[in-house]
C-alpha cells in the first residue's frame, strides 16, 4: 500500500521556508518539477515549476517563490520567501512526465505560518531572514495547465506531531490511487 | 571536485564531549544534504544522522538523540557533530558523507573517536 | 526502526564465480512503486563506495557486473563474475524510514 507521508513547518511572518524535495531517480534530473499547493477537497494547484527540460543549477522565481533543481544531488530546492500567514496550508512536489501522470514526491509540507517576527533565528542562518535576497538571474517558467482526477485526494489530516523530530512524519491512511513515484524522506 | 573532509577526531574520557568538523570544497552544502555515519572497529555502519544545511532541520538516530548536535552554517560550507556525553560504545571512524537521491554518494575519509579513560 | 538483515555473513568464492548477496526487511520499503534499498562496498581502510541505488539503479561508473533486484522485503546484490577487486564488504542500507539503517554486511572472501 501506498504511504503518504508529511512533514510540519511551523514558521513566523516574515520569515522564509527552504526545503528539498529529492527525487530518487537520475532518470528525473531533467523533467520538469512544480510546487503544488493541495486544498482541502480541490485538486493540487501548481504555484511555480522549473523549466522543461529542468536546468541544473537555474533559479526559477515566480513572485515569493525560488526553485532551484540541483541534479548533482537529486535534490528540488523550494524556497518560499516573505511568508503570510495566507500561505499556510499543505504543499508538495511533483515531477512532471507528460503524458504520464505526475509523479509525487514526498514529504508533503504541512506549512503552518502564524503572526510576529520571530528576532531570534532558527538553528541556521539562512533560515528565518526576514529580508530574502533574490537570486540575481531567476527565470519565469511556463507550468502545464496538466490535472487529473486521480490526483484529487481526501486532505490528510493535520499533524499534530512534533517538529523537527524523526517521529514528525505522519503515516496517512486510506489514501488510494495516488501518483506513483516517490522519494526520500 | 566534490569533496569532504572530516577533522576533530581525538581520545576522549568517558562523559566527555567532542566536536567533529566535515569540511565541504566543490558544492554548496545549503544545496543538500550532509549526513554523518559511523563505523565501530570491526564492525558495521551506523547511520547517525542528517542535516538540512539550508533550513537547519535535522533527523537523528534514537541512539544518539539528546547527545549529538548536528549543524552546518552554510556561509562556512562547513557541517559539524557535536558529541556529548561521550560513551565508550561511541569508539569509531566517523565519516561525514554527501546526499544524491536517497543515498549517501559521497564520503569523506573518515576520522576516529577513541572513547576510553 | 527498520532491522536489516543480511545473509550470508561471509560468502567464500573464486574470482570469476558468481557471488550473490541477500539483505531482508523487517518490513517494507517500498513505496510509490520504488525500493529505497541501496548497496555500499567497503574495502579495508576505506569509506564506503555506493554501488546500487532504489534497489536496481547502477551508480554511473559501477562495472556492469554488479546488479540489484528485489522489492518489498527481500533484495538481492549480484556480482556476476567475481574480479579480485570485488571482494570487500557489502552493506545494504534503506531510505525508506529514518532512522536510516544498514544491514550487518556481508564479507565476500577469497577462496
Known amino acids: 500500500a501506498t504511504k503518504l507521508t508529511e512533514e510540519k513547518y511551523e514558521l513566523k511572518e516574515g520569515q522564509t521556508l527552504d526545503v528539498k524535495c529529492d527525487y530518487t531517480l537520475e532518470k528525473f534530473a531533467s523533467s520538469q518539477k512544480a510546487w503544488q499547493i493541495i486544498r482541502d477537497g480541490e485538486m493540487p494547484k501548481t504555484l511555480a515549476c522549473t523549466e522543461r527540460p529542468s536546468k541544473n543549477s537555474h533559479p526559477v522565481q515566480v513572485g515569493r517563490i525560488i526553485l532551484e533543481d540541483y541534479h548533482d544531488h537529486g535534490l528540488l530546492r523550494v524556497r518560499m520567501v516573505n511568508l503570510q500567514v495566507e500561505d499556510s496550508g499543505l504543499y508538495q512536489c511533483v515531477i512532471y512526465q507528460p503524458p504520464k501522470e505526475p509523479h509525487m514526491l514526498f514529504d508533503r509540507i504541512r506549512l503552518v505560518v502564524t503572526k510576529g517576527f520571530s528576532g531570534t533565528p532558527g538553528s541556521n542562518e539562512n533560515s528565518t531572514q526576514n529580508v530574502y535576497k533574490i537570486p540575481p538571474t531567476t527565470t519565469k517558467a511556463l507550468c502545464p495547465l496538466y490535472t487529473s482526477p486521480r490526483t484529487v485526494t481526501q486532505a490528510p489530516p493535520k499533524s499534530t506531531a512534533d517538529v523537527s523530530t524523526p517521529d514528525s512524519e505522519i503515516n496517512l491512511t486510506n489514501v488510494t490511487d495516488i501518483i506513483r513515484v516517490p522519494v526520500f524522506n | 571536485e566534490v569533496q569532504l573532509v572530516e577533522s576533530g577526531g581525538a581520545l576522549v574520557k568517558p562523559g566527555g564531549s567532542l566536536r567533529l568538523s566535515c569540511a565541504a570544497s566543490?558544492?554548496?552544502?545549503?544545496?543538500?544534504?550532509i549526513h554523518w555515519v559511523r563505523q565501530a572497529p570491526g564492525k558495521g555502519l551506523e547511520w547517525i544522522g542528517r542535516?538540512?544545511?539550508?533550513?537547519?532541520?535535522?533527523k537523528y538516530s534514537p541512539k544518539v538523540q539528546g547527545r549529538f548536535t548536528i549543524s552546518a552554517p552554510t556561509s562556512k560550507n562547513t557541517a559539524y557533530l557535536q558529541m556529548n556525553s561521550l560513551k565508550t560504545e561511541d569508539t569509531a571512524v566517523y565519516y561525514c558523507?554527501?546526499?544524491?537521491?536517497?543515498?549517501?554518494?559521497?564520503w569523506g575519509q573518515g576520522t576516529l573517536v577513541t572513547v576510553s579513560s | 526502526e527498520i532491522v536489516l538483515t543480511q545473509s550470508p555473513a561471509t560468502l567464500s568464492l573464486s574470482p570469476g564465480e558468481r557471488a550473490t548477496l541477500s539483505c531482508r526487511a523487517s518490513?517494507?520499503?517500498?513505496?510509490?512503486?520504488?525500493?529505497?534499498l541501496n548497496w555500499y562496498q567497503q574495502k579495508p581502510g576505506q569509506a564506503p563506495r555506493l554501488l546500487i541505488y532504489?534497489?536496481?539503479y547502477q551508480k554511473r561508473g559501477i562495472p556492469a557486473r554488479f546488479s540489484g533486484s528485489g522489492s518489498g522485503t527481500d533484495f538481492t546484490l549480484t556480482i556476476s563474475s567475481l574480479e579480485p577487486e570485488d571482494f570487500a564488504v557489502y552493506y545494504c542500507?534503506?531510505?525508506?524510514?529514518?532512522?536510516?539503517?544498514f544491514g550487518q554486511g556481508t564479507k565476500v572472501e577469497i577462496k
Open positions: 558523507t554527501g546526499h544524491r537521491g536517497g543515498t549517501m554518494d559521497y
Open positions: 566543490g558544492f554548496n552544502i545549503g544545496n543538500t544534504y
Open positions: 542535516i538540512d544545511p539550508a533550513g537547519g532541520r535535522t
Open positions: 518490513q517494507s520499503v517500498s513505496n510509490y512503486g520504488i525500493s529505497f
Open positions: 532504489a534497489a536496481s
Open positions: 542500507q534503506q531510505s525508506s524510514n529514518f532512522p536510516w539503517t
